[in-house]
């Protein structure tokens, strides 16, 4: 008894296609071993016709394929353009030889059944319209015209020229003549349904002098396109239903037994299971649209259908397109946190994976908005200006080649709660969805900057201090200057006398930044942050305003400023918190390059930007947020 299973008998007709599915036991060896389809000869030898190793016999060239679906433990042999010569005994099997595990399949291909000689075959998809052409002689020009459908020996009238219409064809069938034509009439049947298929007879006149035409109507159910996607990746359903439904509401639904449950439609309906990870995008004025779903889950696998109807719901007799989605659990896309938590005033660091083979691709971060079709405006990108309202509090850190980039958002408010997408202009499968949940803070932030109203005077020395709790003691502290192309970590003190410098007084848990001397271009947002290795953690931001020295203003020397910072109560600076670092994403230490690389990535993006002031601090607004 073979552990391989499939259809024992397959029957079809010439010209048709068959898809033979063979099932194998779910083991790692079976998933990866050679799959084959061979034809059993009289001598007992089974000649390979196609195999998963890429072999394709001459007689199958251009008309057959073998696809393995390891997540289903199946493989499918598709054979098109069948002829009667394909009738025979076959084996579908696994193994390096054709004597391994197999299943016997009998394929029978018959001749196309004979219709009356003058039968015209019409092949249409569900929901479409067929126009049946009926010819007649001049003698029947004024006679009754009709179309009937054969049911066994009987022929039931569908429509006739006396304006009779069968109730099941009401509002769907019309009988008409074109122009001055005296020898032909037409019957249109719209919104075709499967039960419309069959043999029709159109007739002009009565009795032996009547003119008759036979029409065979085939109504095709949509053949589902197979989509094979990885867990956590994304899928796009491209839907093209034709001009005739361009103005009707569109939908995507998921088949469930007899029904098809709407996931999204253009009337604003959306399934909560897809909240934050679905977009419906009209493509043109001809009714084309696409639906993108990100963050694919195992339970997303199944049969999907897109369609159009004024109700935004599936309706029999309206055009549809179908897919079957398989979700492969052996995904190349790493598992990242789907929910990130933060508190008001705090910050989050979100790691976005991307295809490591596409390190030069442009990276983006967008905010999913739940308008009627869903949309995701870009907030930040490697070559995109930070959106208004996010200046000074949002930065994207790219590390080419690492397979991930990090987005940091600080000065959080409850309005920041929602869904965000990580995406690139490269491999579209690598789109990930993150839900950000921002709760009201119940205690002071972990990082605090003094002075809080930071105004530096040109030509003087200016120091700001960042207080951190003991739990960050072992982590690296840094200051960086925010600009539209990221937050560039400031060089250490010995990298130039004029440069900003960073020093840390471990005894009082303060990291200070000194600008000496202050210049006009030093104005802007500065971030104080911590990182572990190259994994970014908590950040806080402060806007430093720069002004001219006014006559008579007191001159504070740098040591006084530092001393003032050190006057902060030590207990407060040392306060150790037991709160979980819940607002940090699961960050991978490999994801970040050194500071120089981050700087270079920013400079590179700067070169490509049209706007001249995008990266300069002087170009930033002076208002504090």
């Amino acid at each position: 008894q073979s552990p391989i299973f499939g259809p024992q008998d397959v029957s079809s007709i010439e010209g048709n296609s068959v898809s033979i599915t063979c099932y194998y036991p779910d083991t790692s060896v079976n998933r990866h071993t050679r799959k084959y389809w061979c034809r059993q000869g009289a001598n007992g030898y089974c000649a390979t016709l196609i195999s998963s190793n890429g072999y394709l016999s001459k007689e199958y060239s251009g008309r057959a394929s073998l696809i393995n679906f390891p997540e289903n433990s199946t493989f499918v042999i598709n054979i098109a353009h069948l002829t009667q010569e394909d009738t025979g005994s076959y084996k579908c099997g696994l193994g390096t030889t054709n004597r391994g595990l197999f299943f016997d399949v009998s394929l029978e291909v018959s001749q196309v059944p004979e219709f009356p000689n003058d039968t015209h075959v019409y092949t249409k998809d569900i929901g479409r319209t067929v126009t049946i052409e009926c010819r007649f002689k001049e003698g029947n020009a004024h006679s009754k015209k009709s179309l009937c459908k054969k049911r066994g020996e009987a022929c039931e009238v569908v429509i006739d020229s006396t304006e009779y219409v069968d109730p099941s064809y009401k509002d769907r069938a019309i009988l008409f003549m074109k122009g001055t034509s005296r020898d032909i009439f037409y019957v249109n049947i719209s919104h075709l349904i499967p039960s419309d298929a069959g043999l029709y007879v159109c007739q002009a006149g009565e009795g032996p002098s009547a003119d008759k035409n036979n029409a065979d109507l085939q109504v095709l159910e949509p053949e589902p396109e197979l989509l094979y996607k990885d867990l956590r990746s994304s899928v796009t359903f491209e839907c093209d239903l034709g001009r005739e439904v361009a103005n009707d509401a569109k939908y995507l639904c998921r088949k469930n037994k007899e029904t098809c449950d709407v996931i999204i439609n253009t009337l604003g309906k959306r399934d909560p299971a897809f909240e934050g990870r679905i977009l419906l995008t009209p493509r043109d004025d001809n009714g084309r649209f696409s639906v993108l779903i990100t963050g694919l889950r195992k339970e997303d696998a199944g049969h999907y259908q897109c369609g159009a109807h004024s109700s935004g719901l599936p309706q029999e007799g309206w055009p549809v397109q179908a897919w079957q989605l398989f979700v492969n659990e052996e995904s190349t896309i790493p598992n990242s946190r789907s929910v990130v938590k933060g508190v008001t005033g705090g910050s989050v660091a979100i790691v976005c994976p991307y295809n490591p083979k596409e390190s030069s691709s442009l990276k983006y971060w967008c905010h999913w908005e739940a308008d009627e079709n869903g949309r995701c405006p870009v907030l930040v990108g490697t070559q995109a200006l930070v959106q208004e309202g996010y200046e000074g509090r949002l930065a994207l850190f790219d590390q080419p080649g690492s397979g991930a980039y990090t987005v940091i958002l600080n000065q959080l408010t409850t309005q920041d709660s929602g869904f965000y997408w990580c995406l690139t202009d490269g491999d579209s499968r690598w789109r990930t969805t993150i839900e950000l949940q921002v709760a009201e803070a119940t205690k002071k932030p972990d990082l605090e900057v003094t002075p809080q109203n930071a105004t530096a005077v040109i030509g003087e020395t200016f120091t700001i201090s960042c207080h951190y709790p003991c739990k960050f003691y072992s982590q690296e502290k840094y200051w960086c200057k925010w600009s539209n192309d990221g937050c560039h970590i400031l060089p250490s003190h010995d990298e130039g006398a004029r440069q900003s410098s960073v020093s840390c007084d471990q005894s009082s848990q303060i990291v200070s930044m000194t600008l000496n001397p202050v210049k006009k271009e030093d104005e802007g947002w500065y971030w104080c942050g911590v990182k572990e290795g190259q994994v970014y953690g908590e950040t806080t931001a402060i806007y430093v305003a720069v002004e001219e020295r006014t006559r008579g203003s007191p001159h504070i020397n740098p040591t006084d400023a530092n001393a003032r910072a050190k006057d902060a109560p030590e207990e407060e600076a040392m306060e150790s918190s037991v709160r979980e670092d819940e607002n940090k994403a699961n960050l991978d230490p490999r994801l970040f390059a050194d500071e120089r690389e981050i700087q270079n990535a920013g400079d590179q993006a700067q070169e490509n930007r049209a706007s001249g002031n995008a990266g300069s601090a002087g170009g930033q607004s002076g208002s504090s947020k």
Partner: nanobody, 131 residues
Framework: EVQLVESGGGLVQAGGSLRLSCAAS??????????MGWFRQAPGKEREFVSA???????????YYADSMKGRLTISRDNAKNTVYLQMNSLKPEDTAVYYC???????????????????WGQGTQVTVSS
């Protein structure tokens, strides 16, 4: 909702034959868009796959049979009557069971032996094979 009604069961001697019928009704879809089949359950045992028939279109179909009954079964259907038949030959006492007609609109991509994939089940018809 699809209703399935089985008939044709009964008492038969070992070596004899039976033809089971299953009439389907209540669907807005064409009968050929369903996979139809049979499962059976012997006293104290799990329900097991017997046979299935899937139509891809009016002229292409796939017949599946359980290994244990291969060569003794023929599944067929009459689309005009919305009925599926199971011809069972050379019956053995171990074929004694309640035979259930099943249907699913899910198409070709599922293992027909997996009973979880069938959305509709009949009430069953008893087949008893005496020795």
């Amino acid at each position: 909702e699809v209703q399935l009604v089985e008939s044709g069961g009964g008492l038969v001697q070992a070596g004899g034959s039976l033809r089971l019928s299953c009439a389907a009704s209540g669907s807005g879809r064409t009968f050929t868009s369903y996979t139809m089949g049979w499962f059976r359950q012997a006293p104290g045992k799990e329900r097991e796959f017997v046979s299935a028939l899937t139509w891809a279109d009016d002229s292409t179909y796939y017949k599946y049979y359980a290994d244990s009954m291969k060569g003794r079964l023929t599944i067929s259907r009459d689309n005009a009557k919305n009925t599926v038949y199971l011809q069972m030959n050379s019956l053995k006492p171990e074929d004694t069971a309640v035979y259930y007609c099943v249907a699913t609109g899910r198409g070709l991509t599922y293992d027909p032996r997996d009973r979880r994939k069938y959305d509709y089940w009949g009430q069953g018809t008893q087949v008893t094979v005496s020795s």
